[in-house]
């Protein structure tokens, strides 16, 4: 049993990093793998993560972590057995994922105006929390062409768009998604979609 | 929010123990580090220790091996640290900070007394 | 234990900058973070910079922290008496033996 593809990683930054692997054959990773894991740090303790299947030959494991900080460094030990496969460390801080935003919700009660709102993933104390900038879709579902992406630059989790940029009578879905500039982060994936139905109607 | 509940001033004798606890809230317990600090009358911050809450291991500093034990009950999210042959030099505002390499928050503090 | 060196006291007057050093010898500051702490007379120490330059929440952008080799500086734009205060740094070492040493302290008194 080998190692195709070394395991990578992410993090949230807040509780959880993901790891992927490949296996050089089909593997039931949750029976024949461990990913033992361990913080560089005084009196830290050893954790054990049982990976699930990911295809075939990939396995993929979910790493519980506490209080991640920028100068956590983990080292990471993948067995089969008693047999060591593969050893490795992981800085969390260098590989950061950003959690989707949720609570997505379309305002349409001011008749020119679209308030797009959601929620911030992470809270007050993270690092993450003021350093998130947004990139919010929308598309039509009628329409593949009519397809954009809007930059929320700001920290407020929130875009404003006249509702007369968008055709009238006909249904949208939005969508939004995060990253942090501070830690050259990966973008998260996208929030659930929310559709609504644009009846903006043209003044006379 | 996060709280750190300190116990009360003590005043002990020469040669006696003090044990002072830090009860915690606000967050998740054995989450986070605690460390322990003092600061003696108008002098600066002296790291003493700190202790891991998930497995209740502990370090201290080379200083106070042999006379500081720092504990923890998780049913109740305190931690205690205990000092024993005090002597004059030990009085000083003890503290308990959260945190892993810095102190993100800190209790108010327990002044500790040591005099004949 | 390893100490941090800081100068005892600086002062300016309100709106003014000043500026905060700490230096150490060892391996300490240069293979590490910096944190800094302000103590207000009479209450507990309060994080102010960790990571070398980054604000827990709250913490206004009048203070910004830097570090460079074995020295980092905490810097207070827009003074107010209200700033008026102890400052630490702190950071941690690995060798010999984990610890934590803090700096000697500054005094800052706002003209």
């Known amino acids: 049993m080998k190692v195709l593809q070394e395991p990578t990683c992410v993090s949230d930054y807040m509780s959880i990093s993901t790891c992927e692997w490949k296996m050089n054959g089909p593997t039931n990773c949750s029976t024949e793998l461990r990913l033992l894991y361990q913080l560089v740090f005084l009196l830290s303790e050893a954790h054990t993560c049982v990976p699930e299947n990911n295809g075939g030959a990939g396995c993929v494991c979910h790493l519980l972590m506490d209080d991640v900080v920028s100068a956590d460094n983990y080292t990471l030990d993948l067995w089969a057995g008693q047999q060591l496969l593969w050893k490795g460390s992981f800085k969390p801080s260098e590989h950061v994922k950003p959690r989707a935003p949720g609570n997505l919700t379309v305002h349409t009660n001011v008749s020119d105006t679209l308030l797009l709102t959601w929620s911030n993933p992470y809270p007050p104390d993270n690092y993450l929390y003021n350093h998130l900038t947004y990139a919010v879709n929308i598309w039509s579902e009628n329409d593949p062409a009519d397809f954009r992406i809007y930059n929320v630059t700001y920290l407020e989790p929130s875009l404003r768009i006249a509702a007369s940029t968008l055709k009238s009578g006909i249904s949208y879905r939005a969508r939004v998604r995060a990253w942090a500039q501070c830690y050259n982060t990966t973008w998260s994936e996208w929030s659930p979609s929310t559709k609504w139905h644009n009846s903006y109607r043209e003044p006379f | 929010q996060v709280q750190l509940v300190q116990s009360g001033a003590e005043v002990k004798k020469p040669g006696a123990s003090v044990k002072v606890s830090c009860k915690a809230s606000g967050y998740a317990f054995t989450s986070y580090y605690m460390h322990w600090v003092r600061q003696a009358p108008g002098q600066g911050l002296e790291w003493m220790g700190i202790i891991n809450p998930r497995g209740g291991s502990t370090s201290y500093a080379q200083k106070f091996q042999g006379r500081v034990t720092m504990t923890r009950d998780t049913s109740t999210s305190t931690v205690y640290m205990e000092l024993s042959s005090l002597r004059s030099e030990d009085t000083a505002v003890y503290y308990c900070a959260r945190g892993k390499y810095w102190m993100y928050d800190w209790g108010k503090g327990t002044l500790v007394t040591v005099s004949s | 234990q390893s100490v941090l060196t800081q100068p005892p006291s600086v002062s300016a007057a309100p709106g003014q900058k000043v500026t905060i050093s700490c230096s150490g010898g060892?391996?300490?500051?240069?293979?590490?973070?910096v944190s800094w702490y302000q103590q207000l007379p009479g209450t507990a120490p309060k994080l102010l910079i960790y990571d070398n330059n980054k604000r827990p929440s709250g913490i206004p952008d009048r203070f910004s922290g830097s570090k460079s080799g074995t020295s980092a500086t905490l810097g207070i734009t827009g003074l107010q008496t209200g700033d008026e205060a102890d400052y630490y740094c702190?950071?941690?070492?690995?060798?010999?033996?984990?610890?934590?040493?803090f700096g000697t302290g500054t005094k800052l008194t706002v003209l």
């Open positions: 060892g391996s300490s500051i240069g293979n590490s973070y």
């Open positions: 702190g950071t941690w070492d690995t060798s010999p033996v984990w610890e934590w040493p």
